[in-house]
Interface confidence: low
């Protein structure tokens, strides 16, 4: 999967979309999840709703929102005031059973609220140390990592 | 109407490879799981693996993780399953089956099997 | 994976006669989504297998009414209300809400 990129500002709203197949998914639940590490586990931050006919509700975990538009095939991940915390890989996954497709990786940067007295070109990226080769940062909502980009440093 | 054809019996020689075809028609074949399962002689079902046509997604069961590859054609409506390094225990009848959709949510019932195609690995 | 065990393994019956057929699962089949993916399907001597019921009371099409389907969680049952020569066999449960899908032993049904 190649990861998609989602900037925000810090203390706004950040909507994620994770576009899927409706046939190939459907009957299923969704989640999103924050990857600890590169290869650590996916640590599931809030799912849809419990009966799969009432995904189209929102559910939230603290200021995280999904919902699932099962006929159109969309999950919409919503981070409300958004934090430099927030920056880092996520997923969406669709759950089948004990097992977990991966629908999109997710790049989640914060970028500084210019109106903010800090640094205005400030980033922040997942982990006070790491840091990302190659960043090529661009003024948009969403991207996809580019060739030879990594969504986390390597590990010597 | 649904119909799924497999390709003629095949003799293989230990340590070699078959490739067994399905071709399907009378359904959108892109959007529909279709799954292989054997049946060696006088024995049950066995679930080998899976393919969705439209992304070519797989899953396979461990037991053939590394010795299977399911593939599918979207051009001609065929999903493959090749089965590499035989032994006499691969003799079996193969099957290509598709999942059958029921909505609201999938029934991932196989609703409808090809004639099953017979393996037969020998010395 | 998940075991599925099917009892008895044959069974001889009198035409027009019912007939019972067990299947337990080793966890729970309850899918994510509430569904319940246990199905059963009949393999004629000689033939393809085929589907009978899917998510365990759901009759496929062309599927007489005889068949029934029941059970939950991890205990589930096909009945045959009154058996026909037609429907020798094996009969086969299986799951399919957790990959990798498997199959039960297989019931042998006879015609006394």
């Known amino acids: 999967h190649n990861t998609t990129v989602f900037q925000g500002v810090a203390g706004q709203s950040l909507q994620v979309s994770c576009p899927y197949d409706s046939m190939k998914h459907w009957g299923r639940r969704k989640a999103w999840c924050r990857q600890l590490g590169e290869k650590g586990p996916c640590q599931r931050v809030v799912s849809t709703h419990n009966l799969w006919l009432l995904s189209f509700l929102r559910r939230w975990n603290g200021s995280t929102a999904i919902t699932d538009d099962t006929l159109g095939g969309t999950l919409t991940i919503t981070l409300r005031n958004l934090q430099p915390h927030d920056a880092g890989l996520y997923q969406c996954q669709s759950l089948h059973g004990s097992e977990a497709d991966t629908l999109r990786k997710v790049l989640v940067e914060v970028l500084a609220d210019p109106l903010d007295h800090r640094d205005a070109g400030d980033l922040w990226f997942p982990g006070e140390s790491e840091s990302f080769e190659d960043a090529h940062v661009e003024h948009s909502i969403s991207r996809s990592l580019l060739e030879g980009e990594i969504p986390f440093p390597p590990t010597s | 109407q649904v119909q799924l054809v497999q390709s003629g019996a095949e003799v293989k020689k230990p340590g070699s490879s078959v490739k067994v075809s399905c071709k399907a028609s009378?359904?959108?074949?892109?959007?529909?799981?279709m799954n292989w399962v054997r049946q060696a002689p006088g024995q049950g079902l066995e679930w080998m693996g899976r393919?969705?046509?439209?992304?070519?997604?797989?899953n396979y069961a461990q037991k053939f993780q590394g010795r299977v590859t399911i593939t599918a054609d979207e051009s001609t409506s065929t999903a493959y399953m090749e089965l590499s390094s035989l032994r006499s225990e691969d003799t079996a009848v193969y099957y290509c089956a598709r999942l059958l959709r029921n909505q609201p949510g999938e029934s991932y019932a196989m609703d409808y099997w090809g004639q099953g195609t017979l393996v037969t690995v020998s010395s | 994976d998940v075991v599925m065990t099917q009892t008895p393994l044959s069974l001889s019956v009198t035409p027009g006669q019912p007939a019972s057929i067990s299947c337990r699962s080793s966890?729970?089949?309850?899918?994510?989504?509430?569904?319940?993916?246990l199905h059963w399907y009949l393999q004629k001597p000689g033939q393809s297998p085929q589907l009978l019921i899917y998510k365990v009371s759901n009759r496929f099409s062309g599927v007489p009414d005889r068949f029934s389907g029941s059970g939950s969680g991890t205990d589930f049952t096909l009945k045959i209300s009154r058996v026909e020569a037609e429907d020798v066999g094996v009969y086969y449960c299986?799951?399919?809400?957790?990959?990798?899908?498997?199959f039960g032993q297989g019931t042998k049904l006879e015609i006394k």
């Open positions: 299986s799951q399919s809400t957790r990959v990798p899908y498997t």
């Open positions: 393919i969705y046509p439209g992304d070519g997604d797989t």
């Open positions: 009378g359904y959108a074949f892109s959007s529909s799981w």
């Open positions: 966890q729970s089949l309850v899918h994510s989504n509430r569904y319940t993916y």
